[in-house]
């Protein structure tokens, strides 16, 4: 059956044979009702990847550097199944290039001109692509031929491979370049043992390097990782502490009409049957014809891309920096220590309308990018596509587990002038209920519930965490009737309350009439029996404070907070009456970003933040009429975090231990990929 | 309740120059930051420039140096001169405020421009 078979490309006669190898054997272990294996050759990987783009084959396996172009347009392929190497329990899909040096030296990633280097090999990518790359912009001009500036920027190098007589500074360290391992300090150990040695100050390795020379922890305690961030860190820390995430070797498949789930299905099967130790007449993962047929013989098994993953998010910001870099050329014209732009996301149409006026107000300082969810948002500012945005704690841990990282944390209690250096304990988050009923928190069960959104603090991660301990299932479209939790699967019981309109139904943005605290509040007000919202929400939009018609009738003393000893409250006592304390929102941005953000964001809150009184005649950064846009309209200002800018030490211990609890229930697709 | 009306738009040669101009009715003029937006066939709603009530601009780069924003006040009017104009400038262009704070859109019908030979 055609829709049934997977085309895999091969790029010679060896790869050919075992191709066709890999078909027989599939075709004797699977049902005819399976998928199937059929053998596309094509003379390289790069006319693989056209020719799937082209709908001329299905599958290859490609190395990061070729994933970088397979993603390119106009071919605009995805990786679908990775392998992993290492073993089951423990498997390993990435390697991270790193900048290794002695304890004793003290240098940063921004003072390595005029230092010596050691490199594993010429165009290698942990040894020369990623570290050149990224230092890229800091080499002197003219950048081509690459070698000589290169060696124009360190004062010796040993560059495996590189052109001796043309550039000799590159082979300073050891003469004559030699390309194999009658090299001392060719490849990953070579270049180690180069730095070991004294010849050289650096060596960009990869992070295991370290751990297969050195035995001895004392050893290896004598070198560090140098950090994009201009910091240092121990050899250990290696994924806090790289240039680049790379992925080891990679099938991909086209984005749209990929056969992604007959591709995973097929390969599932094939590592049954033909992995590593299972069968004597085929090997996956070997082969007599050759090394590396179709897979890396080092290969121990495949691993499924979580769907969520693109191509982006899968090599990294920092990789395809690097590898732009290289193929591109090209350097912004402002020098790189000076603060660019800042790209702001705004979720949807009304919040992008607040971030162009903001724009235009801040002399064009704050550029914005727009998406449709919170989730897509997080994914443009991993890639760079945007830098910032403001993210309620739910989202805040979400961010961090992607590499994001705190940067400002939005006050609401703190009066100026303290306010910008005043750390808050953070907000409650509140069941809200009409005072007419007679529910209490032990009796919400068939009853309809108001959710600010899946995944967010007060909204979700507080009351179904507290559910999820009670009732131990994840199922909690069950527990209530019927509800509005924006961000939930459009046929789910929990977005039957909501109110749209129609193609925003239940989106996790400000289309949808009950998203937010607002939002929340306004569907228990319409048609809930209860509201998970901040303490706040009822008093801001009670007595005449929200001017919308559906608001402007409101009495604060119409609604309670329930207590989870099963007691009732006035809206007045949430001290006395919550669910849980909440981390405030909070400012997030990739770590090369956050400096810039900070700095200008404290700059455009002296211009536009709480300290203007006229909102109707000036641009008020927080200010949208209820509607939270961009930042809480009950912020005063963004505070300094001083030591708390990981999300963990941001969000806190309990915090952070109940989402991570909660992870049983994820319906989040990015967090999924963040963590594969 | 704002209304707003652009008018000037029309067909012209690359290369050519046209002036847009946005009549506001309503007394929120002279307060309001406002601006430009455009929507080419098939695209989604792009900031073009923008001006603070106070008269400070802001351009996308795309258009940096070939338009020019700028308001009168008294007329309750604001202008875009386009100049330069290239094939990728061709859309609906729009003019709003942002006195309803994204509150309620005030949209006018837009007005065409077209940049062709």
């Known amino acids: 059956v055609p829709e049934k078979s997977v085309r895999w490309c091969a790029v010679s006669e060896h790869e050919a044979t075992k191709c066709q190898s890999f078909r027989d054997h599939m075709k004797s272990v699977l049902p005819s009702n399976g998928p199937s294996v059929a053998c596309v050759k094509k003379a390289s990987h790069l006319d693989c990847i056209r020719a799937i783009a082209a709908n001329e084959a299905d599958a290859v396996t490609l190395d990061a550097g070729l994933v970088y172009d397979a993603y390119l347009a106009p071919n605009n392929l995805k990786p679908v199944v990775a392998e992993f190497y290492g073993s089951k329990e423990d498997p390993q899909t990435f390697y991270y290039a790193v900048a290794v040096v002695k304890k004793d030296s003290d240098f940063q990633m921004n003072q390595l001109r005029g230092r010596k280097s050691c490199h594993t090999g010429l165009g290698r990518s942990a040894g020369w692509n990623i570290p050149i790359g990224l230092l890229y912009c800091d080499l002197p001009e003219p950048r081509k031929p690459l070698e000589k500036a290169v060696a124009n920027f360190f004062s010796g190098s040993c560059v495996p491979c590189a052109d001796g007589t043309d550039f000799p500074q590159l082979c300073q360290l050891c003469p004559g370049c030699g390309c194999s391992t009658l090299n001392q300090y060719f490849s990953y150990s070579g270049a180690f043992k180069c730095l070991k040695d004294g010849a050289g100050d650096v060596a960009f390795v990869k992070h295991s390097t370290i751990f297969e020379n050195l035995a001895n922890k004392a050893d290896r305690d004598q070198y560090e990782l140098l950090c994009l961030d201009n910091t240092r860190k121990s050899v250990d820390e290696y994924k806090d502490c790289h240039l680049a995430r790379v992925p080891s070797h990679t099938v991909v498949a086209r984005s749209v009409g990929g056969k992604e789930d007959l591709i995973w299905e097929l390969l599932n099967q094939a590592q049954e049957h033909f992995g590593k130790d299972k069968s004597k007449e085929f090997q996956l993962f070997s082969s007599p014809h050759g090394k590396d047929l179709l897979f890396k013989d080092s290969a121990h098994g495949f691993l499924k891309v979580p769907p969520r993953m693109d191509a982006k998010m899968y090599l990294g910001y920092e990789y395809i920096t690097a590898i732009r870099n290289l193929r591109e050329g090209t350097c912004p014209e402002a020098p790189t220590d000076e603060c660019k732009p800042v790209k702001w996301c705004a979720l949807s149409h009304h919040e992008r309308l607040k971030c162009d006026e903001w724009s235009v107000n801040s002399a064009g300082k704050i550029e914005c990018e727009s998406a449709e969810t919170t989730e897509d948002c997080i994914a443009k500012i991993m890639n760079g596509e945007a830098d910032a945005m403001s993210l309620d704690g739910g989202f805040v841990y979400i961010a961090g587990m992607c590499g994001l990282v705190p940067v400002l944390a939005e006050n609401y209690n703190t009066p100026n002038p303290n306010c910008e250096n005043t750390a808050e304990e953070g907000y409650f988050a509140v069941a809200v209920v009409k005072s007419s009923s007679d529910l209490t928190w032990d009796n919400l069960k068939g009853k309809k519930s108001c959710h600010t959104a899946v995944g967010r603090t007060a909204g979700w991660n507080i009351p179904m965490g507290l559910l999820y301990s009670k009732i131990n299932h994840c199922r909690f479209d069950e527990f209530f009737s019927e509800g509005c939790a924006p961000g939930s699967e459009k046929n789910s019981s929990l977005c039957k309350l909501c109110m749209g309109p129609s193609p925003n139904l239940c989106e996790p943005n400000n289309k949808e009439g009950y998203y937010g605290y607002t939002g929340a509040f306004r569907c228990l007000v319409e048609k809930g029996d209860v509201a998970f919202v901040k303490h706040q929400t009822v008093p801001q939009n009670t007595g005449g404070k929200n001017p919308d018609a559906w608001a402007k009738n409101l009495k604060e003393e119409d609604y309670e907070l329930l207590c989870l000893d099963g007691s009732r409250k006035s809206v007045q006592e949430p001290a006395n009456c919550h669910l849980a304390r909440a981390p405030n929102h909070a400012v997030v941005a990739r770590k090369d970003k956050a400096d810039c953000v900070q700095t200008l964001l404290l700059d455009q809150q002296r211009m536009f933040g709480s300290s203007v009184t006229d909102c109707s005649s000036n641009f008020c950064l927080f200010e949208s009429k209820t509607k939270d846009l961009l930042f809480r309209d009950d912020t005063v200002c963004l505070a300094k975090l001083h030591d708390r800018n990981t999300y963990e030490k941001y969000l806190g211990e309990e915090y952070v231990k109940a989402v991570t609890n909660l992870r049983k229930c994820s319906t989040s697709p990015l967090l999924e990929a963040c963590t594969f | 309740e704002v209304q707003l009306v652009e008018s000037g738009g029309g067909l012209v040669q690359p290369g050519g120059s046209l002036r847009l101009s946005c009549a506001a009715s309503?007394?929120?003029?002279?307060?309001?930051?406002m601006a430009w937006y455009r929507q080419a066939p098939g695209k989604g709603l792009e900031l073009v420039s923008g001006?603070?009530?106070?008269?400070?601009?802001n351009y996308r780069d795309s258009v940096k140096g070939r338009f020019t924003i700028s308001r009168d006040n008294s007329k309750n009017t604001m202008y875009l001169q386009m100049n330069s104009l290239r094939a990728e400038d061709t859309a609906v262009y729009y003019c709003?405020?942002?006195?309803?704070?994204?509150?309620?859109?005030?949209w006018g019908q837009g007005t065409l421009v077209t940049v062709s030979s």
């Open positions: 709003t405020d942002y006195s309803s704070r994204y509150y309620h859109d005030y």
């Open positions: 309503g007394s929120i003029f002279s307060i309001a930051t």
């Open positions: 001006i603070t009530r106070s008269g400070s601009t």
